[in-house]
Amino acid sequence: EEELQVIQPDKSVLVAAGETATLRCTATSLIPVGPIQWFRGAGPGRELIYNQKEGHFPRVTTVSDLTKRNNMDFSIRIGNITPADAGTYYCVKFRKGSPDDVEFKSGAGTELSVRAKPSAPVVSGPAARATPQHTVSFTCESHGFSPRDITLKWFKNGNELSDFQTNVDPVGESVSYSIHSTAKVVLTREDVHSQVICEVAHVTLQGDPLRGTANLSETIRVPPTLEVTQQPVRAENQVNVTCQVRKFYPQRLQLTWLENGNVSRTETASTVTENKDGTYNWMSWLLVNVSAHRDDVKLTCQVEHDGQPAVSKSHDLKVSAHPKEQGSNTAAENTGSNERNIY
């Protein structure tokens, strides 16, 4: 003898987050009379998703007109799917009863899986700057994806990195997942223009991975090299001494001139020149009135770069004999006409 069966033809349905899921259900008979209900999960803790008879289910629409008595299609559509909607959905036929309807037959269930895109990877570097030859750690995080399978790669200037560790959480079943990866990068003096890239590939991205980037310019500190030179005499009794501050990054730099240990002038790097590698050069000069000094003068160029302890370079200025020829006597210390032209 024929008896009503509830057919859920789809064992599983895969839907992208934000889209609409269609869960199909057909009853093979119009009798017994009674409503259909949809549940997520089975057993006493199951969640009511739709009740044909009563209730308000704003995200659910029926595919067919359930008010028509000859309808056998009890499929539903659930709008604006999120990973939290994942689960097994059951179409259940009830038989009209008094006072309550009685559960009559259930479908085999349809597993709804939600494909959710990972969020844009966020790459963060160390809190403090580090100098070349040091190893620094970068972290990359992406959240909210499903299914769990995901691939993460690290690159530095297009070259794939191998020294990293990645975790996907949680380990067990979940509606959505997060990935966290830490990569170790050795800094070089040429890294001002370098980029570290975290690349995430997931089934939802259709072969177009998401990328997060960090500029090493935010991480690196290249300390300056100093050179103090004495220039030819510019005027009667005056000597021009320059301090070349080379290959530093970032630009934040303060220079102090000391004459025999006493502060003569302090200035902040302003009109710098940029090198191809992104580092900066700067020059400061000091006019020393030789006639004001009876003894030799020790000139010190002291540089405080990016809040670090000061570095300095000194130069002994001899004032005892032939002040007019002083410049020519020390011309060998001149670093070249290019620097002379800067000021």
Epitope: E1, E2, L4, P9, T22, R24, T26, T28, S29, L30, I31, V63, S64, D65, K68, N70, N71, M72, D73, S75
Partner: antibody, heavy 122, light 107 residues
Framework: QVQLVESGGGVVQPGRSLRLSCAAS????????MHWVRQAPGKGLEWVAV????????LYADSVKGRFTISRDNSKNTLYLQMNSLRAEDTAVYYC???????????????WGQGTMVTVSS | DIQMTQSPSSLSASVGDRVTITCQAS??????LNWYQQKPGKAPKLLIY???NLETGVPSRFSGSGSGTDFTFTISSLQPEDIATYYC?????????FGGGTKVEIK
């Protein structure tokens, strides 16, 4: 007026394929479930397949399951039946028919086409 | 599948006669039963739906009754244009099934 016109029938060898079409006019095709029903020469009527108004649900008679595919193009007001692996016992007049009530997967047929003959013979 | 047994398989009656056809279902199908008329070389036409409801435009000499397993189709006064084969069809259970048909002829 409300009309269904089938086409695509003919003589075909066993194991071969054929596609039937049913052009609908005079009603809102996209609101109705549609069926194929066949009738072997000198025999009674046999239901073959149904498709929901929006194509979301399809059901087949056991005798054609896995061989026949019902589909529709609501933009063209046309119903289709793709028949593969045809057998001699598939020889019949094939009718397309409309479900009586809008937006239902119902099995009362209120409008029928004139039919198209399919002969499966070697 | 639900078996639908129609009787008689054919009948001959005079114009103006009352004609009755019966249809028996192999199990209870409530009142989910339709009656169709098929003239030679033509498509079937719905006459009665839900066992007793007359389809729009169908002459009132056609009627139907019954519920459960036993159903009756009646032509109260046979007309020459009623020469056709009549089929019952249940749509309570899938797949929908038809009776074997009753061929009505004029004496």
């Amino acid at each position: 007026q409300v009309q269904l016109v089938e086409s695509g029938g003919g003589v075909v060898q066993p194991g071969r394929s054929l596609r039937l079409s049913c052009a609908a006019s005079g009603f809102t095709f996209s609101s109705y479930g549609m069926h194929w029903v066949r009738q072997a020469p000198g025999k009674g009527l046999e239901w073959v397949a149904v498709i929901a108004y929006d194509g979301s649900n399809k059901l087949y008679a056991d005798s054609v399951k896995g061989r026949f595919t019902i589909s529709r193009d609501n933009s063209k007001n046309t119903l289709y039946l793709q028949m593969n692996s045809l057998r001699a016992e598939d020889t019949a007049v094939y009718y397309c028919a409309r479900t009586q009530l809008k937006y239902t997967l119902g099995f009362a047929f209120d409008i029928w086409g004139q039919g198209t003959m399919v002969t499966v013979s070697s | 599948d639900i078996q639908m047994t129609q009787s008689p398989s054919s009948l001959s009656a005079s114009v103006g006669d009352r004609v009755t056809i019966t249809c028996q279902a192999s199990q209870d199908i409530s009142n989910y039963l339709n009656w169709y008329q098929q003239k030679p070389g033509k498509a079937p036409k719905l006459l009665i739906y839900d066992a007793s409801n007359l389809e729009t435009g169908v002459p009132s000499r056609f009627s139907g009754s019954g519920s459960g397993t036993d159903f009756t189709f009646t032509i109260s006064s046979l007309q020459p244009e009623d020469i056709a084969t009549y089929y019952c069809q249940q749509f309570t259970y899938l797949p929908p099934t038809f009776g074997g048909g009753t061929k009505v002829e004029i004496k």
